[in-house]
């Protein structure tokens, strides 16, 4: 906290400019008018104030706006945004995408901070849903943003926003998140033809049910092994050898390298060895010939 002292003669700031970097903290406190600072916030970003000097400028704004800053000031905070706490940000009402972009730009190239997370949360809640423009903006700055949301939060993403999602945006999503996103993607891309549809839906297939995988196997999609390995195990298990062969096309040979990993390992255990042998890949671990396979889950459902 800077002590209240009178501004030395001739040092009263008439505008926010570079000369202020030579002011000591107490001089900034005494000589810079908070209202002037608020109206000329856009200049602060170009001035190499120290971290400590920015503390003083923040303090002045806090005194001027104890209930939270107006958006006209927020949009021009620049590096002063780095001084804000999540508690400060919760007082804001940010409605403009331009304001959001301006503040995300300040943190560009750095990990998502608690301040940024709070800002995004406030913005999205204010909008009521994660619309396409917002999602476009957020994933441009933070490719992993979507995967940081809970399944509940993802449920507010309208299918139209899915067009903004790039494959890398889903890299860190877990199956629960893909379970929510996949149906939205299926809806969003439903009017595309086979090959184009597959290109778009591919990244979301970690949430696809068995029946959709069966349908894809009839479309000569040639799914790569990386995509196959991300499929839900419970969705892969019911697929026949013939269906997997059709699904993977020329990539089926890759199964051998993955035979010890899920979901391939579990799928092999469910297939007849005879059927696996038809692939000519030397896959081992299938059900020996002459054995009867009982589906216990079906039996439990009936009893």
């Amino acid at each position: 906290e800077v002590e209240k002292t009178a501004c030395p003669s001739g040092k009263k700031a008439r505008e926010i400019d570079e000369s202020l970097i030579f002011y000591k903290k107490w001089e900034l406190e005494a000589c810079v008018d908070a209202a002037l600072l608020a109206t000329q916030m856009d200049r602060v970003n170009a001035i190499p104030f120290t971290y400590e000097q920015l503390d003083v400028l923040k303090h002045k704004l806090d005194e001027l706006y104890p209930q939270g800053y107006p958006e006209s000031v927020i949009q021009h905070l620049g590096y002063l945004f780095l001084k804000m706490s999540p508690e400060d940000i919760r007082k804001w009402n940010v409605t403009s995408l331009e304001t959001l972009k301006a503040l995300l730009e300040v943190n560009k190239g750095h990990e998502m901070s608690p301040q940024v997370a709070t800002l995004i949360d406030r913005f999205v809640k204010g909008r009521g849903q994660l619309d396409k423009d917002t999602l476009d903006t957020l994933t441009a700055f933070y490719p992993g943003y979507l995967c940081s949301l809970s399944p509940e939060e993802l449920s507010s993403v309208p299918p139209s926003s899915i067009w903004a999602v790039r494959p890398q945006d889903l890299d860190t999503c877990d199956p629960r998140q893909l379970d929510v996103l996949y149906p939205k993607a299926r809806l969003a891309f439903q009017n595309m033809n086979g090959s184009e549809y597959f290109v778009k839906i591919q990244s979301f297939l970690g949430g696809a049910p068995t029946e959709d995988l069966k349908a894809l196997s009839q479309q000569n999609v040639s799914m790569d092994l990386a995509t196959f390995m991300k499929l839900r195990t419970d969705a892969v298990l019911p697929l026949t050898v013939a269906e997997v062969q059709k699904l993977l096309g020329p990539h089926v040979e890759g199964l051998k390298a993955e035979e010890r990993h899920r979901p391939v390992r579990d799928w092999i255990l469910r297939q007849r060895q005879d059927d696996l042998d038809t692939l000519g890949l030397g896959l081992q671990g299938g059900i020996p010939n002459g054995y009867l396979v009982l589906d216990l889950s079906m039996q439990e459902a009936l009893s």
Partner: nanobody
Framework: QVQPVESGGGLVQPGGSLRLSCVVS????????MAWYRQASGKERESVAF????????LYLDSVRGRFTISRDIYKKTVYLQMDNLKPEDTGVYYC??????????WGQGTQVTVSS
């Protein structure tokens, strides 16, 4: 944020000269105004010289004006501080930084300047 690397400090007698250099690699050097700062033992860090991103606007702390000269070479991504007629009160660790670096509190090691007879 890439840390600046300062050099050129040393022990010099009053009235002597030093030329400090600061290399800022890895950042978009031409995008930012730069400043030299100094911190004397137990004191607040203070700005001593400023140069705008185009090099046209140059400002100095009152106590160094006429003795210090700041300049920048955009091709070498280097900022210089020529210090002449040095005084004992110029003693301290000298740092350079840009607005993003200073705001994030990311500093180099600095270079020690000692003015003493």
């Amino acid at each position: 944020q890439v840390q600046p690397v300062e050099s050129g400090g040393g022990l010099v007698q009053p009235g002597g000269s030093l030329r400090l250099s600061c290399v800022v690699s890895g950042s978009d050097f031409t995008e930012d105004a730069m400043a030299w700062y100094r911190q004397a033992s137990g004191k607040e860090r203070e700005s001593v010289a400023f140069v705008s991103k185009d090099g046209k606007r140059i400002l100095y702390l009152d106590s160094v004006r006429g003795r210090f000269t700041i300049s920048r070479d955009i091709y070498k991504k280097t900022v210089y501080l020529q210090m002449d007629n040095l005084k004992p009160e110029d003693t301290g660790v000298y740092y350079c930084n840009s607005a993003p670096g200073a705001a994030r509190n990311v500093w180099g090691q600095g270079t020690q300047v000692t003015v003493s007879s």
